[in-house]
Interface confidence: low
């Protein structure tokens, strides 16, 4: 009579995490008498998965009734598969012995691979803001996926980026993997409304990639431009000087007026005008009583934006010779002449 063969027809089986895995095994003979066992791995380190003879294996069910007369099917189903279940499973026939059963023959093994979805990608930007023309780094992380093969792409406003580096860990075999990618993005003045997207494609996602996003508004600081001008006034002894603060981001801004270097007024920007590109404008004005000055006045508009070092623009308000002579009787308009910024 032909010697018993242990047949494991499938070399490999792939299952999604959470599903059940069916591992098939058949014998070609009822002889010799003895139990079958399923193991994960081979050699000394193998792990018992199912023992026909004894033990409690709550996740394992047999596909057919093993006690049924002439049964030769020893397939099993393992429920609620996780990545930790990946490995090669062996169906092993034992020969009844005394005191212990003796291993008789093993199947060729079935490799179980577990498909586990990557976690939602988490994108994080730089810890501190940077100004346009500078490069900032964004990182993207996703964990817990299997198998190892995965594709990651970066986009900025729909345009694919090429300056990034990606690692999949660990390098060797593992039950599940993590991906970490760092992209370098050059900021432009119009990036307040821009977005970076990290897109991950994996076999478990069936063509529907996962995306993580980050807004460049969290990473950019657009410094303001200042313009000081004099507005026409009806009252002859007053000058209305405005400081136009333009195209800044984020909102946080404090403005100080100085007259000849002395603080005249400090205010915090409140009612801002938002531009189409997401930056803000703001205007502050200072009313100068020209009759109180016998000499020219240097007016400085000083702006502290987003906790950075203050920037300023100064203008000389010229008091005319006639006005200097007659004090408050003067009827001529004071002239405003720009000076270089301080």
């Amino acid at each position: 009579e032909d010697e018993l063969q242990v047949i494991q027809p499938e070399k490999s089986v792939s299952v999604a995490a959470g599903e059940s895995a069916t591992l098939r095994c058949a014998m070609t003979s009822l002889i010799p008498v003895g139990p079958i066992m399923w193991f994960r791995g081979a050699g000394a380190g193998r792990e018992l998965i199912y023992n026909q003879k004894e033990g409690h294996f709550p996740r394992v069910t047999t596909v057919s009734e093993l006690t049924k007369r002439n049964n030769l099917d020893f397939s099993i189903s393992i429920s609620n598969i996780t990545p930790a279940d990946a490995g090669t499973y062996y169906c092993v026939k034992f020969r009844k012995g005394s005191p212990d059963d003796v291993e008789f023959k093993s199947g060729a093994g079935t490799e179980l691979s577990v498909r586990a979805k990557p976690s939602a990608p988490v994108v994080s930007g730089p810890a501190v803001r940077a100004t346009p023309e500078h490069t900032v780094s964004f990182t993207c992380e996703s964990h817990g996926f299997s198998p190892r093969d995965i594709t990651l792409k970066w986009f900025k406003n729909g345009n694919e980026l090429s300056d990034f580096q990606t690692n999949v860990d660990p390098a060797g075999d593992s039950v599940s993997y993590s991906i970490h990618s760092t992209a370098r993005v050059v900021l432009t003045r119009g990036d307040v409304h821009s977005q970076v997207i990290c897109e991950i494609a994996h076999i478990t996602l069936q063509g529907d990639p996962l995306r993580g996003t980050a807004n460049l508004s969290e990473a950019i600081r657009v410094p303001p431009t200042l313009e000081v001008t004099q507005q026409p006034m009806r009252a002859e002894n007053q000058a209305n000087v405005t400081c136009q603060v333009s195209n800044f981001y984020p909102r946080g801004l404090q403005l100080t007026w100085l007259e000849n270097g002395n603080v005249s007024r400090t205010e915090t920007a409140s009612t801002l005008i938002e531009n189409k590109d997401g930056t803000y404008n703001w205007m502050s004005w200072l009313l100068v009583n020209t009759c109180a000055h016998r000499d020219d006045v240097v007016l400085t508009c000083q702006v502290e934006h987003d906790g950075q070092q203050a920037v300023s623009k100064s203008y000389a308000l010229e008091i005319s010779a006639h006005q200097k002579e007659h004090g408050s009787d003067i009827t001529h308009e004071a002239a405003l002449a720009p000076t270089a910024p301080l």
Partner: antibody
Framework: QVQLVQSGAEVKKPGASVKVSCKAS????????MHWVRQVPGQGLEWMGW????????KYSQKFQGRVTITRDTSATTAYMELSSLRSEDTAVYYC????????????WGKGTTVTVSS | DIQVTQSPSSLSASVGDRVTITCRAS??????LNWYQQKPGKAPKLLIH???SLQNGVPSRFSGSGSGTDFSLTINSLQPEDFATYYC?????????FGGGTKVEIK
């Protein structure tokens, strides 16, 4: 580079216990097993047990069952072997060795820790 | 438990000789057999794993063969640094076990 650094030599009295440490570096500690093997002077190698550093699974040789305890601290990347109820025949060099997870060969060994049991 | 019997327990050879050490397991262990070299006062060093796979960094004059119950380690053209004790080890089932060792001495 991959290395295993063991604790220093110990002299113990019969009935006492000894705990030997093995600090791993240069590889992912949890990706391998750690074996403990001893060698009595002038004799061959004797396997005592292993610990799978990843999941903590332990297997002891029946000969040492009940007297040996193998543990690991993954944060310190260190394995430990404690042998209790020492007798004079436990005088030996105790080695830790990194183990492969499939063929269970031992590819990196510590230099050994000499344990002398004497009254 | 699986017993591993190594032979001979010692042998004398000269530099340049071809030396073969054998190892027999008490039951079939497929290819779960490894070979180690140990010099006095030193830790063992892995030479061959899985019966015939040469460990990284080990000279190619060392080779292993066998499957099932009978295995051998061959050193082609023995070098002065090869005089040492050699052990085989089965890793098919626990307890893992070593052969008794073969001491290779200078003739």
């Amino acid at each position: 580079q991959v290395q295993l650094v063991q604790s220093g030599a110990e002299v113990k009295k019969p009935g006492a216990s000894v705990k030997v440490s093995c600090k791993a570096s240069g590889y992912t500690f949890t990706s391998n097993a750690m074996h403990w093997v001893r060698q009595v002077p002038g004799q061959g190698l004797e396997w005592m047990g292993w610990i799978k550093a990843g999941n903590g699974e332990i297997k002891y040789s029946q000969k040492f069952q009940g007297r040996v305890t193998i543990t690991r601290d993954t944060s310190a990347t260190t394995a430990y072997m404690e042998l209790s109820s020492l007798r004079s025949e436990d005088t030996a060099v105790y080695y830790c060795a990194r183990g492969d997870y499939y063929y269970y060969y031992m590819d990196v060994w510590g230099k050994g820790t000499t344990v002398t049991v004497s009254s | 438990d699986i017993q591993v019997t190594q032979s001979p327990s010692s042998l004398s050879a000269s530099v340049g000789d071809r030396v073969t050490i054998t190892c027999r397991a008490s039951q079939s262990i497929s290819d779960f057999l490894n070979w180690y070299q140990q010099k006095p006062g030193k830790a063992p060093k892995l030479l061959i794993h899985a019966a015939s796979s040469l460990q990284n960094g080990v000279p190619s004059r060392f080779s292993g063969s066998g499957s099932g119950t009978d295995f051998s380690l061959t050193i082609n053209s023995l070098q002065p640094e090869d005089f040492a004790t050699y052990y085989c080890q089965q890793s098919y089932s626990t307890p893992l076990s070593f052969g008794g060792g073969t001491k290779v001495e200078i003739k």
